[in-house]
Interface confidence: low
């Protein structure tokens, strides 16, 4: 499983990550696959 900071759930209400994030019921987006250094 992904264990990096990339996988931390972000706190920007209502935004969906362009790279495949899933907006949860509380509208907090999950960052999927977009981490750059």
């Amino acid at each position: 499983a992904c264990d990096t900071a990339t996988c931390v759930t972000h706190r920007l209400a209502g935004l969906l990550s362009r790279s495949g994030g899933v907006v949860k019921n509380n509208f907090v987006p999950t960052n999927v696959g977009s981490k750059a250094f």
Epitope: C2, D3, T4, L15, L16, S17, G21, A36
Partner: antibody, heavy 122, light 107 residues
Amino acid sequence: EVQLVESGGGLVQPGGSLRLSCAASGFTFSNYWISWVRQAPGKGLEWVAEIRSESDASATHYAEAVKGRFTISRDNAKNSLYLQMNSLRAEDTAVYYCTSYFDYGLAIQNYWGQGTLVTVSS
Amino acid sequence: EIVLTQSPATLSLSPGERATLSCKASKRVTTYVSWYQQKPGQAPRLLIYGASNRYLGIPARFSGSGSGTDFTLTISSLEPEDFAVYYCSQSYNYPYTFGQGTKLEIK
């Protein structure tokens, strides 16, 4: 204007210490995850260490090669990142870049400094 | 540690040609791959993140594709300023790792 400016590099003897700094401006520093990435002369890129954002408890991670010798830290009030390097070895010789990252959800921001050269030699 | 292997090591092409650069991961990294361009004496520049997303201000001739273990950076029509070294990186597992680089040179 967004800027990351590294400083603190120089010539140090094997076994010595050095503290690198990275001064940030033009963006909300505390929101960003920041890494140090190094590049030995004529070689490729190597990740060194990462510190997460203030909201992610400023958690840290290190490459195995530097674990126990290097310490990454940040001072959000000063918009500054640091890398304390102890027990330096010849193989630590490299240009050290700081690079910051933030995900807006719809896009990301990624900034790099121009690097500071660390030379470990007797 | 996840090893990224880039190929070819050197690619010799002419302006206007299409460039295809490969990056293979030793383990599955889903889409946690980025591509960087680096010119001599300069810091790396992010081109692609999340395997296929173009970074801000990056021209449309740059595109990324792939998932799992196989990734590709394509430059559809080379401009003179595109000749540089290109690195892929993964951020799926610690430690973050980079490929060894592909040098894109003018033929």
